[in-house]
Amino acid sequence: IINGSDCDMHTQPWQAALLLRPNQLYCGAVLVHPQWLLTAAHCRKKVFRVRLGHYSLSPVYESGQQMFQGVKSIPHPGYSHPGHSNDLMLIKLNRRIRPTKDVRPINVSSHCPSAGTKCLVSGWGTTKSPQVHFPKVLQCLNISVLSQKRCEDAYPRQIDDTMFCAGDKAGRDSCQGDSGGPVVCNGSLQGLVSWGDYPCARPNRPGVYTNLCKFTKWIQETIQANS
């Protein structure tokens, strides 16, 4: 997150970290069910661990943390590497979470976002770009949903209805390492960090997010079929 600020503790209990061993964070994810996460399809790895209820980036033990293995990762069948359409994936955890103030699911919004909607994006991704500098704790940033026209103008011939753009002033954006993390609008999960320009936070080059309102049926049906 570029030019965000430290999230208040306990305010993002659905935020998950996807870790490669030993403790290397490579993507964010979102708890949407007691045993299921959503993340970006481009975050798929065969071997990874899931950390929930953790505030700092470092692997230091925190009393609220819960660790999991992913037993199944199900990318949206319409995703195409290295493209950006349908960039979402469900991950089934090896057990159900223990609900606490630090670990709790969020509902996926069935309403598509309208321009001007205020949202919050969070993650442990780099706080500088093109340099790489990772934060000590989870970062939060307020962003606004842009109209689909402004989105298409920013990225001609690259935007479809499985994506939406959001941003703030130049210099504020999600970035590498935030992928798969949540965009929360009006208390519901509206999007996942998907892609954007490089370096991040360039003028008139907003962040692009997976438009989850288009996938509520797939999410529900996939969880039911694999539970």
Partner: antibody
Framework: EVQLQESGPGLVKPSGTLSLTCAVS????????MSWVRQPPGKGLEWIGD???????DYASWAKGRFTISQDSSKNQVSLKLSSVTAADTAVYYC???????????WGQGTLVTVSS | AYDMTQSPSSLSASVGDRVTITCQAS??????LAWYQQKPGKAPKLLIY???TLASGVPSRFKGSGSGTDFTLTISSLQPEDFATYYC????????????FGGGTKVEIK
Amino acid sequence: EVQLQESGPGLVKPSGTLSLTCAVSGFPLSNYAMSWVRQPPGKGLEWIGDIYPSDIIDYASWAKGRFTISQDSSKNQVSLKLSSVTAADTAVYYCARDNNDYGLDIWGQGTLVTVSS
Amino acid sequence: AYDMTQSPSSLSASVGDRVTITCQASQSISSWLAWYQQKPGKAPKLLIYLASTLASGVPSRFKGSGSGTDFTLTISSLQPEDFATYYCQQGYTNSNIINTFGGGTKVEIK
């Protein structure tokens, strides 16, 4: 050097049990999923199953119940056990490492197992 | 069922030819497809993963493309060392799978 080496008996009697070992060197099992694949003489590759560092195991539908995949991280080895073998289980058996992006990037040389009395 | 069908099962070609092998999945596997080359008496070798990403040390004459259900391996100019059998493998799911591999395509000298 990153290397996999399968070992086990070259000949097994029908209805017997086959046990194969894959010795892993050059990388820790804790970081990778491992696969077992077999190839009957003159035929194609057949996926048997995968084992993950967490000891989660996926088997091909036809392999469930007959094959058992396990690992010993302290010895850095993966094992494959097959009960009630028949002539149809005659094959070259390979272990392989997944590169974490769903491609098998390191393979053992394979070990030929013949089922015959 | 996610069955993988390769075609052709064999083909004859000459050095310098452009060769195309196809792999079809019975359901969408997105981009989780790998290609392997196997020579007689040897273990398979990874050529391409994620449908189009070239594995380390693989010559650029090998190219993978496709997504969803239809995938292609193209060898732009066949070299003597390319005569071998090629297999595709899906990595989309391991659930209720008979085989993750396609049946193979043998590339022979014309």
